[in-house]
Amino acid sequence: HTAAQDNCTCPTNKMTVCSPDGPGGRCQCRALGSGMAVDCSTLTSKCLLLKARMSAPKNARTLVRPSEHALVDNDGLYDPDCDPEGRFKARQCNQTSVCWCVNSVGVRRTDKGDLSLRCDELVRTHHILIDLRHRPTAGAFNHSDLDAELRRLFRERYRLHPKFVAAVHYEQPTIQIELRQNTSQKAAGDVDIGDAAYYFERDIKGESLFQGRGGLDLRVRGEPLQVERTLIYYLDEIPPKFSMKRLTA
């Protein structure tokens, strides 16, 4: 978990502090908030990024209808507990001893309870649907060009293996990107779809997590793709457990 950049910075995570006291005097970068060393050759986990953020001085229609079990992150920012590998702990609690269970992307998947609440396992989010609305353009984007550009973005900028970008749907002005990654599919070293989606979300909001890079400049055949709204749905391998009160609200 060290970075060996000449100028001792972390290209994939600006929420770090780097110093030349790693093994052999090499550059080592640590996430703010947790103090954990991070691997600057890949994306940092969403849990460590959220922790750093909280510590630093939100007809056959081609569009997908999110499942009834899809979760949206309505709770906003919180200071999460991360496990030794930087993943979200299954149970999260706030300072007032209110606790809840989260999935692998840190989104609440149960009602809130007290300290007696049990979260037996971290449930994996295996399907993420990123729903974007782009600003008006002279005409619609060519679907295959748009598809190719978004796949390239996830492959090159976020280092996500192309096989995890399941589909790109387009019905002007709505774009949907489907990311799928089962536990069995994710090999050691593979970027997690939850981390890639979080980096993308921050890029779209103009809050890039990359060090020193310009913001995201998305273009399709030279035409700027400017996003005006983003909604992300998370589907877990095991459906969430909310009370009927919430479901009917």
Epitope: H1, S19, D21, P23, Q28, R30, S34, A37, P57
Partner: antibody, heavy 116, light 111 residues
Framework: QVQLVQSGAEVKKPGASVKVSCKAS????????IGWVRQAPGQGLEWIGD????????NYNEKFKGRATLTADTSASTAYMELSSLRSEDTAVYYC?????????WGQGTLVTVSS | DIVLTQSPDSLAVSLGERATINCRAS??????????MHWYQQKPGQPPKLLIK???NLESGVPDRFSGSGSGTDFTLTISSLQAEDVAVYYC?????????FGGGTKLEIK
């Protein structure tokens, strides 16, 4: 050569505050974390927290949060550790060290005695 | 917090003999690349002195009779041939996550 020189011994009353300084020389002060560790008489080492002078970033051991304050004056290449609401159990030698963990250079230590 | 348990608490070894000190972490402090465990020597009235960094990297100026090994949760500091000047208390420390805790120390004496 790298050196960390700490301020002299202090005697304080319970409830008071103490501020220990650590002057660094021989390296670029803003490039390395400065950690603070204490050692009660006859006891082991206890990590208080650390500060990155280059950006003022700090980490604290939860046990000391709210009582310990780490600061740094980059113009003077000096780090400070202030501990408030002192009690007798805070009697210890306080050390500064260069590095996040695996501190390679240490100050000589500052004895802080808390006694009424 | 990660708890580091050192064993034994104290150790008496004859001059020229091998001394072995263990440190067990309550959770893994290693990645596939590095182990975030360090070893210090402290003599009475002196600050700790770094001996081994990242489990096995000998600090410059430290005699090569000192060596470190281990990964995951179990780490060892070995002195291959004990010298009189090695009498001291030895501490392990991790730097995996905040807080960077220390082990309780092992007092090494001459038998």
């Amino acid at each position: 050569q790298v050196q960390l020189v700490q301020s002299g011994a202090e005697v304080k009353k319970p409830g008071a505050s103490v501020k220990v300084s650590c002057k660094a020389s021989g390296y670029t002060f803003t490039n390395y974390w400065i950690g603070w560790v204490r050692q009660a008489p006859g006891q082991g080492l206890e990590w208080i927290g650390d500060i990155y002078p280059g950006g003022g970033y700090t980490n604290y051991n939860e046990k000391f949060k709210g009582r310990a304050t780490l600061t740094a004056d980059t113009s003077a290449s000096t780090a400070y550790m202030e501990l408030s609401s002192l009690r007798s159990e805070d009697t210890a030698v306080y050390y500064c060290a260069r590095g996040t963990g695996g501190g390679d250079y240490w100050g000589q230590g500052t004895l802080v005695t808390v006694s009424s | 917090d990660i708890v580091l348990t050192q064993s034994p608490d104290s150790l008496a070894v004859s001059l020229g003999e091998r001394a072995t000190i263990n440190c067990r972490a309550s959770q893994s402090v290693s990645t596939s690349s590095y182990s975030y465990m360090h070893w210090y020597q402290q003599k009475p009235g002196q600050p700790p002195k770094l001996l081994i960094k990242y489990a096995s990297n000998l600090e410059s100026g430290v005699p090569d009779r000192f060596s470190g090994s281990g990964s995951g949760t179990d780490f060892t500091l070995t002195i291959s041939s004990l010298q009189a000047e090695d009498v001291a208390v030895y501490y392990c420390q991790h730097s995996w996550e905040i807080p960077y805790t220390f082990g309780g120390g092992t007092k090494l004496e001459i038998k």
